[in-house]
C-alpha cells in the first residue's frame, strides 16, 4: 500500500528550525566543513546536497528532512539544483545561516533581493577562517 504523504514543511517551519539550531551557537556538527553553494536557484536542493554528507550530527537532522521534502516538492526541483562552489568550504553553521538569510528574504518578499547578504557573509567567513589559521 502507498505510504502516507507527509505535507511539505512551510517556509515558516523551516525558519523556526533554522533559528532554533543557530541561535547562540558558535558552531554546529563539531565544526564540520561543507561545500559552499551558489544561492541562485534551487536553493533547498543545493543546501541539501551539501548538508547530506554530514553524518552523526543530530542537530541538523530535522533541517535535512525539511530540505529533502522541499527539494522534492516540485518535479523539476531536483533538476535546477544550484552549483556548488567546489573551491570553497565553509562551516555547517555558516551554510545554515546563509540558508536562513535566504529563506527569510523569500518569506518576506517572494523574490529575494538580499542575495548580497549571503555572498558578503561567505566572504567574511572565508576571511575570518583564513585569518584564524594564519595566526595559529
Amino acid at each position: 500500500s502507498p505510504s502516507p504523504v507527509t505535507p511539505s514543511p512551510t517556509l515558516k517551519e523551516l525558519i523556526e528550525e533554522l533559528v532554533n539550531i543557530t541561535q547562540n551557537q558558535a558552531s554546529l556538527c563539531n565544526g564540520s566543513m561543507v561545500w559552499s553553494v551558489n544561492l541562485t536557484a534551487g536553493m533547498y536542493c543545493a543546501a541539501l546536497e551539501s548538508l547530506i554528507n554530514v553524518s552523526d550530527c543530530s542537530a541538523i537532522q530535522r533541517t535535512q528532512r525539511m530540505l529533502k521534502a522541499l527539494c522534492s516538492q516540485k518535479p523539476a526541483a531536483g533538476q535546477i539544483s544550484s552549483e556548488r562552489s567546489r573551491d570553497t568550504k565553509i562551516e555547517v553553521i555558516q551554510l545554515v545561516k546563509n540558508l536562513l538569510t535566504y529563506v527569510r528574504g523569500v518569506y518576506r518578499h517572494g523574490n529575494f533581493r538580499g542575495l548580497n547578504d549571503i555572498f558578503e557573509a561567505q566572504k567574511i567567513e572565508w576571511h575570518e577562517h583564513h585569518h584564524h589559521h594564519h595566526h595559529h
Epitope: 523556526e16 543557530t22 528574504g105 518576506r108 518578499h109 533581493r113 542575495l115 567574511i124
Partner: antibody
Framework: EVQLVESGGDLVKPGGSLRLSCAAS????????MSWVRQAPGKGLQWVAT????????YYSDAVKGRFTISRDNAKNTLYLEMNRLRAEDTAVYYC???????????WGLGTLVTVSS | QAVLNQPASVSGSLGQRVTISCSGS????????VGWYQQLPGTRPKTLIY???FRPSGVPDRFFGSRSGSTATLTISGLQAEDEADYYC???????????FGGGTHLTVLG
C-alpha cells in the same frame, strides 16, 4: 545582555533631515534582521522600515517610502535611519528593534524622540 | 497601511483570566509569525510572545499566545494589578510586504 540604544532624536523643522542611530550589543548583530518602529504621542505602534541581516534587503512602510532610508554598519554593530523631507506627522518616539523571526520582535530599544515642528 | 484588528479595550478582575484577540487575513496572521507586546504607561514596549507561542525568558507563564487560522490570541491568566497596560500584536503581511501592528488593546484590571 541584549542592548539597543538609539540616539539622534531632535527638534527639526518641516522639510528638514535627521539621522537616527542604534548601537546594538549583547548578540551577534549580523545574524538578525533589524527594524525601526515609531509611536506618535498618544497613538499606537507603527512600523517604519526593516533591513535584512546583511543590509541588502530593505522594506519600508508607505508612510515613509522615498523619504527615509534604513541602513546598517555590521562592522560597527549599528543600525541607522536617514530621515529626509520630514513632516509634522513624523513626530514620534522611534524604537530600534531586533527581530528573531520576520516581523516578530524579541527586543526593543529605549527609543529616541523626533519632533517635527516649525 | 492596514492594521490588524484588536478590541480597543478589555477588562477583568484580579485573579481572573482575559483574552485579547488579533484578527487578520490569510496573507498575514494566517501564515506569519505573531508577536505580542505589552506597554506600561510611559515606558517602551516589552515583548511577551514571539513566533506565535514563545515567551522570552523572564516573562511569566501567565501569558500565553496561540493562533488559529487568521486570528491570534493572547491569554493572560491570574490577572495582576501590574498587568494594566496597552497590548499590541504584530505580524508580516506578504501581499503588502509590510510589518503590521494591531491598533492596540487597553487592559483595565478591576479591583
Amino acid at each position: 545582555e541584549v542592548q539597543l540604544v538609539e540616539s539622534g532624536g531632535d527638534l527639526v523643522k518641516p522639510g528638514g533631515s535627521l539621522r537616527l542611530s542604534c548601537a546594538a550589543s549583547g548578540f551577534t548583530f549580523t545574524d538578525y534582521d533589524m527594524s525601526w518602529v515609531r509611536q506618535a504621542p498618544g497613538k499606537g505602534l507603527q512600523w517604519v522600515a526593516t533591513t535584512s541581516n546583511g543590509g541588502s534587503g530593505t522594506y519600508y512602510s508607505d508612510a515613509v517610502k522615498g523619504r527615509f532610508t534604513i541602513s546598517r554598519d555590521n562592522a560597527k554593530n549599528t543600525l541607522y535611519l536617514e530621515m529626509n523631507r520630514l513632516r509634522a506627522e513624523d513626530t514620534a518616539v522611534y524604537y530600534c528593534v531586533k527581530e528573531i523571526y520576520p516581523a516578530s520582535i524579541d527586543f526593543w530599544g529605549l527609543g529616541t524622540l523626533v519632533t517635527v515642528s516649525s | 497601511q492596514a492594521v490588524l484588528n484588536q478590541p480597543a479595550s478589555v477588562s477583568g478582575s484580579l485573579g481572573q483570566r482575559v483574552t485579547i484577540s488579533c484578527s487578520g487575513s490569510s496573507s498575514n496572521i494566517g501564515r506569519g509569525f505573531v508577536g505580542w507586546y505589552q506597554q506600561l504607561p510611559g515606558t517602551r514596549p516589552k515583548t511577551l510572545i514571539y513566533g506565535d507561542t514563545f515567551r522570552p525568558s523572564g516573562v511569566p507563564d501567565r501569558f500565553f499566545g496561540s493562533r488559529s487560522g487568521s486570528t491570534a490570541t493572547l491569554t493572560i491568566s491570574g490577572l495582576q494589578a501590574e498587568d494594566e497596560a496597552d497590548y499590541y500584536c504584530s505580524t508580516w503581511d506578504d501581499s503588502l510586504a509590510a510589518l503590521l501592528f494591531g491598533g492596540g488593546t487597553h487592559l483595565t484590571v478591576l479591583g
